[in-house]
Amino acid sequence: APTSSSTKKTQLQLEHLLLDLQMILNGINNYKNPKLTRMLTFKFYMPKKATELKHLQCLEEELKPLEEVLNLAQSKNFHLRPRDLISNINVIVLELKGSETTFMCEYADETATIVEFLNRWITFCQSIISTLT
């Protein structure tokens, strides 16, 4: 059974992931981003279901494409280089989903823009955090 300290750790990691995703979204999704329109041509795959931490496997599998899109962005939009930012997210995702169980991600038929993709995972983080508090 999860202890209060492990729950607290999970909550902190989710909050960190949430902040990272929100930072990316805020950095790209405004008219001052000269690459926004071209970034919106990139296709992202969405999870069929995202209600548990194991479903973060679907986010992990899309981190490389996410990095490719962020490479288009001007570095001033973010505190870190895309590679470092994605690396940080990857570490958190691996810790949250755990590596001992192998989960096969199922994707929805509809693809999404980077904005829809980030909003979906932001909602996921907020939803899980709310169940922990």
Epitope: Y31, T37, E110
Partner: antibody, heavy 119, light 108 residues
Framework: QVQLVQSGGGVVQPGRSLRLSCAAS????????MNWVRQAPGKGLEWVTF????????NYADSVKGRFTTSRDNSKNTLYLQMNSLRAEDTAVYYC????????????WGQGTMVTVSS | SYELTQPPSLSVSPGQTATISCSGD??????AYWYQQKSGQAPVLVIY???RRPSGIPERFSGSSSGTMATLTISGAQVEDEADYFC???????????FGGGTKLTVL
């Protein structure tokens, strides 16, 4: 309604210059990046140049680099294309087009203006 | 340089289904957009993000994408659908904006 009205086309000799204008109305022009796209007679569409909402960053197709300059005057809600050292292959209908902020394409187009480069 | 390849022309009878293809290596990771251009007019967006239809575009227009191929389908083509159709996207890195060569659709 949202509109882009173009002017400034015409017939010009090779090596000469021409300036196209694109007047925007019905939306906050200063919030949108803009583009020029051209279409040679009987041919397809070719993206020419891009300018950010504030005019600080520009991008050009290789075919016009060093000869064409895009600019904007947000106080006049107007986009410009200065075309220098014109060549016969620049003969085309030129369209101004707005960059969408919600989808990855051009969502509003001007009516087009014909530029003919001929001696 | 990156290219999007379309058939140059297609002819259908009114009421028939018109299917226009657009091939591009980046499509597994890039959305396709479709513009309709009637003679002497500016292009109009009819499909965006592979399958989505802007408001005001008739339901007979639909789009799909699979692998390296994007497709525009006009179910029950009308005479007023006669136009040039251009697919549009960006290259693999998202750096370059690219139009297909266009497909001239004749409805007669």
């Amino acid at each position: 309604q949202v509109q882009l009205v173009q002017s400034g086309g015409g017939v010009v000799q090779p090596g000469r210059s021409l300036r196209l204008s694109c007047a925007a109305s019905g939306f906050t022009f200063s919030n949108y990046a803009m583009n020029w796209v051209r279409q040679a007679p009987g041919k397809g569409l070719e993206w020419v140049t891009f300018i950010t909402y504030d005019g600080h960053w520009k991008n050009y197709a290789d075919s016009v680099k060093g000869r064409f300059t895009t600019s904007r005057d947000n106080s006049k809600n107007t986009l410009y294309l200065q075309m220098n050292s014109l060549r016969a292959e620049d003969t085309a209908v030129y369209y101004c087009a707005r960059d969408s902020t919600t989808l990855g394409a051009f969502d509003v187009w001007g009516q087009g203006t014909m530029v003919t480069v001929s001696s | 340089s990156y290219e999007l390849t379309q058939p140059p022309s297609l002819s259908v009878s009114p009421g028939q289904t018109a299917t226009i293809s657009c091939s591009g290596d980046a499509f597994p990771r890039k959305f396709a957009y479709w513009y309709q251009q009637k003679s002497g007019q500016a292009p109009v967006l009819v499909i965006y993000e592979d399958t989505r239809r802007p408001s005001g575009i008739p339901e007979r227009f639909s789009g799909s994408s699979s692998g390296t191929m994007a497709t525009l389908t006009i179910s029950g083509a009308q005479v007023e659908d006669e136009a040039d159709y251009f697919c549009y996207s960006t290259d693999t890195t998202g750096t370059h904006r690219v139009f297909g060569g266009g497909t001239k659709l004749t409805v007669l």
